[in-house]
Amino acid sequence: MMTGTIETTGNISAEKGGSIILQCHLSSTTAQVTQVNWEQQDQLLAICNADLGWHISPSFKDRVAPGPGLGLTLQSLTVNDTGEYFCIYHTYPDGTYTGRIFLEVLESSVAEHGARFQIP
């Protein structure tokens, strides 16, 4: 009986130009994790294979860093990064578990812009 569940960071937001950590955690199962895929809508971002380690898709190499753990760090965020992200845990013997995260990338706050200017 497969009792595993995926816990994710859920709906998260971050500022343009900043970075964010996408995290999932597989619990309530003793299944062995053989590989974790990170996907964004219709693109594969990265793979963490238990034997082979991390592989970052070439188109994301400059902006994606592996970890912490089985998570993924997205850097230099743009508004176009807004959307759904998926952590896909391939396990033995349970099968494949999928978690969803929605990321919203916001324009930098007015307060932050304002702090850059000196008022005479």
Partner: nanobody, 127 residues
Framework: QIQLVESGGGSVQAGGSLRLSCATS????????MGWFRQAPGKEREGVAA??????????YVADSAKGRFTVSQDNAKNTVYLQMNSLKPEDTAMYYC??????????????????WGQGTQVTVSS
């Protein structure tokens, strides 16, 4: 609403082959979890195979009773899942069902709880 329609069943001699098809519609999840199950007369329904598909590729899971004989595959362009059955035995005689589930609700495997079911297609293997 997800709809599943199986085809390809029939009668075959032991050692023969059949390919079952499952045409799917209304499946809107970005990842796909599809399964094949069978139920022989007077027996409980059992999982035969499952396939998980995403942009990162496909993973297939086949029950021990079908390993080395049955393969599951998917044609994304046709929204169709297949069960290729080779070296059929009389004990493979059963009604075969295609099933689908949300990929976000537990694991995808032939042992998982599936939500959507087709009407089934009969497979009869004679000795």
């Amino acid at each position: 609403q997800i709809q599943l329609v199986e085809s390809g069943g029939g009668s075959v001699q032991a050692g023969g082959s059949l390919r079952l098809s499952c045409a799917t519609s209304g499946y809107t999840y970005r990842q796909k979890c599809m399964g094949w199950f069978r139920q022989a007369p007077g027996k409980e329904r059992e999982g035969v195979a499952a396939i998980y598909t995403s942009v990162g590729g496909s993973r297939t899971y086949v029950a021990d009773s079908a390993k080395g004989r049955f393969t599951v595959s998917q044609d994304n362009a046709k929204n169709t899942v297949y069960l290729q059955m080779n070296s059929l035995k009389p004990e493979d005689t059963a009604m075969y069902y295609c099933a689908a589930k949300s990929p976000y609700d537990g694991a995808c495997s032939y042992e998982a709880d599936f939500t959507y079911w087709g009407q089934g297609t009969q497979v009869t293997v004679s000795s």
